[in-house]
């Protein structure tokens, strides 16, 4: 109950941290115009990783894409490929996750299949996560790079008469949406990773009969390990993992990886 | 047609109050910014505050912060400036301004104004 | 605060003249973030209420003239009638949109 619990709780958590993940990249507000120097603008610009924008005080918003590849800077690129790997590693992650589940039944899937989707999947997020978080301190870092060297030359004037003020940009809401978001996906793929702990059996699944020599009532029957294997008479063997849950007959009727030492 | 009128002027002591309303018609009053400007005797324009459609936000010019207050009533259409503490040099003609939409913040519409005298 | 400059104060012309007026701001309405420069010209005609001529330093107003032109970016801005009709004369007025307090200029009067 735990490990479903804790498995559904990651899945959830994971799911959420995705969705912020894709909403951080598609927000234009990664980087905001700094009001420190004039709180009272009639203009305010603000940046994304795809399109610039500026909103008017007369409430007008006007943003244009960045419609070159070549003259981007490479940090940006940077930030825009490892965004996009996170959403990618993490819509994979998500479709693993939904079949791993172990609320949801596909089939006859075993326990040992699910909790190595389990644990796939939490790998796929917790690198998602670390993409999306590591995406966001790149930009982060070249803002207060950039945040710096402006400050430095913040007025350049002809003969300190007229002032040209440089705009300087600060964090905009994307990146603490990616930062959260992206700690969230990584929460959610530890949680799947101690999941699959718990989902994958305890001891080695040999699909055999026990042999029981300590009484007499107990007769040695050659045909049991075929039985076994599904291929021999229809004994009703019952599985030693399992708990005797279900005969041989519930079980698929062809071999699986286990079936052979 | 765009319309705006200007209304609530007239003479006023010194340090007495006065609120100026403008009624607009022929767009949507809520989807503008609107700015009060006036005009001193002696010609000169001056801005005085905008009621900014981007988060409700109000501005005014240092000379009357704190005295003078902009607001608006959009079920009625109307813009107000609610002037107190007057003082000689708040006399003016004062205009009441729509910041057009894709304007780059300038004003594209203006009523005729209305006349506010602060004497003794 | 920007201080919105602008020459000559008063300016006497005659019909057909080209005029050219000008106004100097004391700290750039070039907005880096659109490429745009924030400042607009006005027509004043005794009575009346100012009437926008031009937005953005170049964009003319619809329905004003096309032998009014805007210039100019960063600090320094023109305004240019090509040919001076008799209904021009008036008082000319630029304004900074970029920053508050939006100031204007003290006016370049258009006189025969």
């Known amino acids: 109950m735990a490990v479903t619990a804790c498995q559904g709780l990651g899945f959830v958590v994971s799911l959420i941290g995705i969705a912020g993940i894709i909403a951080a990249t598609c927000m234009d507000q990664w980087s905001t115009q700094d009001l420190y120097n004039n709180p009272v603008t009639a203009v305010f610009n603000y940046q994304g990783l795809w399109r610039s924008c500026v909103r008017e005080s007369s409430g007008f918003t006007e943003c244009r894409g960045y419609f070159t590849l070549l003259g981007l800077p490479a940090m940006l690129q940077a930030v825009r490929a490892l965004m996009i790997v996170g959403i990618v590693l993490g819509a994979i992650g998500l479709l693993v996750s939904i079949f791993a589940l172990k609320c949801i039944r596909i089939g006859s899937m075993e326990d040992s299949a699910k909790a190595n989707m389990t644990l796939t999947s939490g790998i796929m997020f917790i690198v998602s996560g670390l993409c999306a978080i590591a995406g966001v301190s790149v930009f982060a870092n070249m803002l207060v790079t950039n945040f710096w060297m402006s400050t430095a030359n913040m007025y350049t004037g002809m003969g300190g008469m007229v002032q040209t003020v440089q705009t300087r940009y600060t964090f905009g809401a994307a990146l603490f949406v990616g930062w959260v978001a992206g700690g969230l996906t990584l929460i959610g793929g530890v949680m799947m990773c101690i999941a699959c702990r718990g989902l994958a059996p305890e001891e080695t699944n040999y699909k055999a009969v026990s042999y029981h020599a300590s009484g007499h009532s107990v007769a040695y029957k050659p045909g049991g390990f075929k039985a076994s294997t599904g291929f021999g008479s229809n004994t009703k063997n019952k599985k030693i993992y399992d708990g005797g849950a279900r005969t041989e007959d519930e079980v698929q009727s062809y071999p699986s990886k286990h079936d052979y030492v | 047609e765009v319309m705006l009128v200007e209304s609530g002027g007239g003479l006023v002591k010194p340090g007495g109050s006065l609120k100026l309303s403008c009624v607009a018609s022929?767009?949507?009053?809520?989807?503008?910014?609107m700015s009060w400007v006036r005009q001193t005797p002696e010609k000169r324009l001056e801005w005085v505050a905008t009621?900014?459609?981007?988060?409700?936000?109000?501005y005014y010019v240092d000379s009357v912060k704190g005295r003078f207050t902009i607001s608006r009533d959009k079920a009625k259409n109307t813009l107000y400036l609610q002037m107190s503490s007057l003082r000689s040099e708040d006399t003016a003609l004062y205009y009441c301004?729509?910041?057009?939409?894709?304007?780059?913040?300038?004003?594209?519409?203006w009523g005729q104004g209305t006349s506010v005298t602060v004497s003794s | 605060d920007i201080v919105m400059t602008q020459s000559p104060s008063s300016l006497s012309v005659s019909a057909g003249e080209k005029v050219t007026m000008s106004c100097k701001s004391s700290?750039?309405?070039?907005?880096?973030?659109?490429?745009?420069?924030?400042l607009a010209w006005y027509q004043q005609k005794p009575g009346q209420p100012p009437k926008l001529l031009i937005y953005?330093?170049?964009t003319r107003e619809s329905g004003v003239p096309d032998r009014f032109t805007g210039s100019g970016s960063g600090t320094d801005f023109t305004l240019t009638i090509s040919s001076v009709q008799a209904e021009d004369l008036a008082v000319y007025y630029c304004?900074?949109?970029?920053?508050?307090?939006?100031?204007f200029g003290a006016g370049t009067k258009l006189e025969l």
């Open positions: 301004a729509r910041l057009g939409q894709t304007q780059r913040n300038a004003m594209d519409y």
């Open positions: 022929g767009f949507t009053f809520s989807s503008y910014t």
């Open positions: 009621l900014s459609v981007v988060g409700g936000n109000t």
């Open positions: 700290q750039s309405l070039l907005n880096s973030g659109n490429q745009k420069n924030y």
């Open positions: 953005g330093a170049s």
């Open positions: 304004q900074n949109d970029y920053s508050y307090p939006l100031t």
